[in-house]
C-alpha cells in the first residue's frame, strides 16, 4: 500500500512524545456528535483570533463566562492523507488531538463523504489523560476492504458547541477491474451489423478492454474502457465476452449468446376444446419463436368432404392467447385444422393437421301448411302441418314445439307444447272463449329449435256459435290470416 503524509506546524503543542504505556487507556467503539440542544454551556468562542487567520478546523475559544480564562486553540494533528490498498486487505487509520482537560465536554465522530458513520463496529477511541491534557486517538478500522469503502474520511470533534474537523484521509481501494456495463445477449437478423458495449473501472486506471468471440480474441490492440464492438453481421450463433485489464490483473465478463433470428417452428398440440353446430374452439402450443417474438397466427380450416371443392378458409388471429374460436362453419361437418405462426422473419410451417367435427344444427326451415280449426266440441283446437324439408346437417328430427298465444280484452298468455317427431297433427285445449288464438310451430332436432312457422290466428267465439271453418298458413306475402267465425 502507498501512503502519503504531510507535516505542518501544529497550532497547539501536541501530546509530547510517544504515548506513555502506563497511562490509563479507555476504549470506545464510537464516540460521536452529541445533540446538545437546550443544554449548551455558555462557553463562548470568537471566530477569529488576532494575528491569525481562522482556518475552519481550529476551535479558537476566547473567554468564558467564568470570567477571563483564555482557552488555547485546538486542532487535529495532521496524519496520513491518502491510503491506497488492495481489495480484501485490512486497513486502520486514525486521527488524534490533544485536548486540555479544561474542555470537560467533548465528543468525537467519524464521517465519510459528508455522512456520519453511525455503525459502532469499526471505530475505537482511546484516551490518554494526564494532569493537563488528554490525548485522544480515534481509530477507524475496516476489515477486508471493498470498493464501497473508497472515500474521504474525517474526524469531527464537538467541543462546547464548536466543531473541529480533521484533515481528510482518502481511502483508495484498488482491485481487479469492475464491470459497470457488460455485453447483453441479443437476437439479430442474419448478416446485419450490431453493437456490443463493455465498460469497466478501477482503481487502478486505466482499464483496457479486449473482445472475445467464440473463445478467440477479436481485437489485437486493447481499447480503453468503455469499448463498443461493432460486429458487421453473423450467419450463425456466436458467444461474445470482454476482458478488462488493469495493473492488478484481468476480469472477464459473462459470455453472452448472440442468436440469429429465424422463422418460428410450427405450433404443436393443436387441441379441440369445444364444438358447436357452427363453431370450434381450438388451442395450440407455440413452437420455438426463432429468437424473434411472434406477431400473429393463422388458423387454416379445410372441409373434409369428397363433394367439397377442397378450398381452405384462413382465419388470422393474434399470437396470444394461443386459442381461437373458428366461426361460420357448417353444422354436422368434418374439418381438418392446422395452425401457423409468424415472426418478423416469416411464417412457420403449419402444425400437424387435426380432425374436428361440428355438431348437429337446428333446423333451418319451419313446418309447412299449418292449419288450425276449432273442433266440434268447441273444447279443443286441432292443428295440422307438414314435416319440413330439413338438410342433413340439421340432424335427425326429434319433435315439434307448438306455441299458442291467447289474447282477450288486453290479456295475453303464451303456452308451449312439445310433440314427437312422428306426429303431424296436435290438439290443444281451448284456454279462453271470445279470444284470438295464435299458433306457430317449429321443428326440433338435437341441434336445437328451428324457426317458427308464420303465425296462424283463429278466433274462439263465445259459447253458442256454430261455424267450424279452419285457418291456415297464408300464401307467401299475405298478412297474418285470421278467421272470424
Amino acid at each position: 500500500a502507498i501512503t502519503e503524509a504531510r507535516e505542518e506546524a501544529k497550532p497547539y503543542p501536541l501530546f509530547p512524545g510517544p504515548l506513555p504505556g502506563s497511562l490509563q487507556t479507555d476504549h470506545t467503539s464510537l464516540l460521536s456528535l452529541p445533540h446538545t440542544s437546550g443544554y449548551q454551556p455558555a462557553l463562548m468562542f470568537s471566530p477569529t483570533q488576532p494575528g491569525r487567520p481562522y482556518t475552519g478546523n481550529v476551535a479558537i475559544p476566547r473567554v468564558t463566562s467564568a470570567g477571563s480564562k483564555l482557552l488555547p486553540p485546538l486542532a487535529f494533528k495532521h496524519t496520513v492523507g491518502h491510503i491506497i490498498l488492495s481489495e480484501h486487505k485490512d486497513v486502520k487509520f486514525n486521527c488524534s488531538i490533544s485536548v486540555p482537560n479544561i474542555y470537560q465536554d467533548t465528543t468525537i465522530s467519524w464521517w465519510k463523504d459528508g455522512k456520519e458513520l453511525l455503525g459502532a463496529h469499526h471505530a475505537i477511541t482511546q484516551f490518554y489523560p494526564d494532569d493537563e491534557v488528554t490525548a485522544i486517538i480515534a481509530s477507524f478500522s475496516i476489515t477486508s476492504v471493498q470498493r464501497s469503502d473508497n472515500g474521504s474520511y474525517i474526524c469531527k470533534m464537538k467541543i462546547n458547541n464548536e466543531e473541529i474537523v480533521s484533515d481528510p484521509i482518502y481511502i483508495e481501494v484498488q482491485g481487479l477491474p469492475h464491470f459497470t456495463k457488460q455485453p447483453e445477449s441479443m437476437n439479430v437478423t442474419r448478416n446485419t451489423a450490431f453493437n456490443l458495449t463493455c465498460q469497466a473501472v478501477g482503481p487502478p486506471e486505466p482499464v483496457n478492454i479486449f473482445w472475445v468471440q467464440n473463445s478467440s480474441r477479436v481485437n489485437e490492440q486493447p481499447e480503453k474502457s468503455p469499448s463498443v464492438l461493432t460486429v458487421p453481421g453473423l450467419t450463425e450463433m456466436a458467444v461474445f465476452s470482454c476482458e478488462a485489464h488493469n495493473d492488478k490483473g484481468l476480469t472477464v465478463s459473462k459470455g453472452v449468446q448472440i442468436n440469429i433470428k429465424a422463422i418460428p417452428s410450427p405450433p404443436t398440440e393443436v387441441s379441440i376444446h369445444n364444438s358447436t353446430a357452427h363453431s370450434i374452439l381450438i388451442s395450440w402450443v407455440p413452437g420455438f419463436d426463432g429468437y424473434s417474438p411472434f406477431r400473429n397466427c393463422s388458423v387454416q380450416v379445410k372441409e373434409v368432404d369428397p363433394l367439397s371443392n377442397g378450398s381452405v378458409m384462413i382465419f388470422n388471429t393474434s399470437a396470444s392467447p394461443h386459442m381461437y374460436q373458428i366461426k361460420q362453419l357448417q353444422a354436422l361437418a368434418n374439418y381438418s385444422i392446422g395452425v401457423s405462426c409468424m415472426n418478423e422473419i416469416g411464417w412457420s410451417a403449419v402444425s400437424p393437421w387435426i380432425l374436428a367435427s361440428t355438431t348437429e344444427g337446428a333446423p333451418s326451415v319451419a313446418p309447412l301448411n299449418v292449419t288450425v280449426f276449432l273442433n266440434e266440441s268447441r273444447d279443443n283446437v286441432d292443428i295440422r302441418w307438414m314435416k319440413p324439408l330439413t338438410k342433413r346437417q340439421a340432424g335427425e328430427l326429434v319433435g315439434y314445439r307448438i306455441s299458442h298465444v291467447w289474447q282477450s280484452a288486453g290479456i295475453s298468455k303464451e303456452l308451449l307444447e312439445e310433440v314427437g317427431q312422428n306426429n303431424s297433427r296436435a290438439q290443444i285445449s281451448v284456454q279462453v272463449h271470445n279470444a284470438t288464438c295464435t299458433v306457430r310451430i317449429a321443428a326440433v332436432t338435437k341441434g336445437g329449435v328451428g324457426p317458427f312457422s308464420d303465425p296462424v290466428k283463429i278466433f274462439i267465439p263465445a259459447h253458442g256459435w256454430v261455424d267450424h271453418a279452419p285457418s291456415s298458413t297464408p300464401a307467401p306475402g299475405n298478412a297474418d290470416p285470421v278467421l272470424i267465425i
Epitope: T28, P34, H35, N101, I102, Q104, D131
Partner: antibody, heavy 120, light 107 residues
Framework: QVQLVQSGSELKKPGASVKVSCKAS????????MNWVRQAPGQGLEWMGW????????TYADDFKGRFVFSLDTSVSTAYLQISSLKAEDTAVYYC?????????????WGQGTLVTVSS | DIQMTQSPSSLSASVGDRVTITCRAS??????VAWYQQKPGKAPKRLIY???NRHTGVPSRFSGSGSGTEFTLTISNLQPEDFATYYC?????????FGGGTKLEIK
C-alpha cells in the same frame, strides 16, 4: 486515590434552603466536570446536570432549572449543590459524581451521598 | 429526551448462575452506555463504560455488549456480593438518562 466526600445528612423544613458540598481529592479538581444525581427514597437514579470545574459553567436538566444551583470553590476542590424553597418531594439522597476522561460523559467516581429530608 | 428501558425490573438467581440484564434506548446512542451497581444505602459503583469496557478493578465475570439501541450486562458465575440493583446510563445525549434499574435477588 480519587475520593469524593459529601457533607452529612440534612433535615429541613419546607421553604428552607440547603447546600450540599462535595469535596474532591486525589486528582486535579479542574480537570474533570462534576455531575449531580438525585435518588428519591426507593426510586431510581436521576441526572440533575453538571458543572464545568474549570470554567464554572453549569448545565441543568430541565426538571432542575430554577431552584437548583451548582457552584464551585476551586481553592478547596469542592463542588456545591444548593436547593432553595425546599419541598417535600425534594426529599432524596443527592450524589456528586465525577465525569470520566475528557470526551466522555460517564461517571467514574461517586460521592457517598447526602440525604436531604424535607419535612414539617 | 432519550428513554432507557431496562428489563427485567427484578430478577431472582442463585450463586453460580449466569444472568443478563437488558437496556433498550429509544434512539441510537452508538456505544455511549455505562452500567452501575448499587447496594442498599451505598453510592453506585462503576462497572462498565462505553458499552463493553470494564473499569479497573471490576471482576471479569461482568461483561457488557451492544451498540445502537440494544445493550446487555451479563454476570456469569454469580457471587454473593453481586446481589444488588443495577442501572444503565446513556451518556450520548443531554439530558443523560438512567434505566429504571434491575434488582437482582438471591433465589
Amino acid at each position: 486515590q480519587v475520593q469524593l466526600v459529601q457533607s452529612g445528612s440534612e433535615l429541613k423544613k419546607p421553604g428552607a434552603s440547603v447546600k450540599v458540598s462535595c469535596k474532591a481529592s486525589g486528582y486535579t479538581f479542574t480537570n474533570h466536570g462534576m455531575n449531580w444525581v438525585r435518588q428519591a427514597p426507593g426510586q431510581g437514579l436521576e441526572w440533575m446536570g453538571w458543572i464545568n470545574t474549570y470554567t464554572g459553567e453549569p448545565t441543568y436538566a430541565d426538571d432542575f432549572k430554577g431552584r437548583f444551583v451548582f457552584s464551585l470553590d476551586t481553592s478547596v476542590s469542592t463542588a456545591y449543590l444548593q436547593i432553595s424553597s425546599l419541598k417535600a418531594e425534594d426529599t432524596a439522597v443527592y450524589y456528586c459524581a465525577r465525569k470520566g476522561v475528557t470526551a466522555a460523559r460517564y461517571f467514574d467516581y461517586w460521592g457517598q451521598g447526602t440525604l436531604v429530608t424535607v419535612s414539617s | 429526551d432519550i428513554q432507557m428501558t431496562q428489563s427485567p425490573s427484578s430478577l431472582s438467581a442463585s450463586v453460580g448462575d449466569r444472568v443478563t440484564i437488558t437496556c433498550r434506548a429509544s434512539q441510537n446512542v452508538r456505544t455511549a452506555v455505562a452500567w452501575y451497581q448499587q447496594k442498599p444505602g451505598k453510592a453506585p459503583k462503576r462497572l462498565i463504560y462505553l458499552a463493553s469496557n470494564r473499569h479497573t478493578g471490576v471482576p471479569s465475570r461482568f461483561s457488557g455488549s451492544g451498540s445502537g439501541t440494544e445493550f446487555t450486562l451479563t454476570i456469569s458465575n454469580l457471587q454473593p456480593e453481586d446481589f444488588a440493583t443495577y442501572y444503565c446510563l446513556q451518556h450520548w445525549n443531554y439530558p443523560l438518562t438512567f434505566g429504571g434499574g434491575t434488582k437482582l435477588e438471591i433465589k
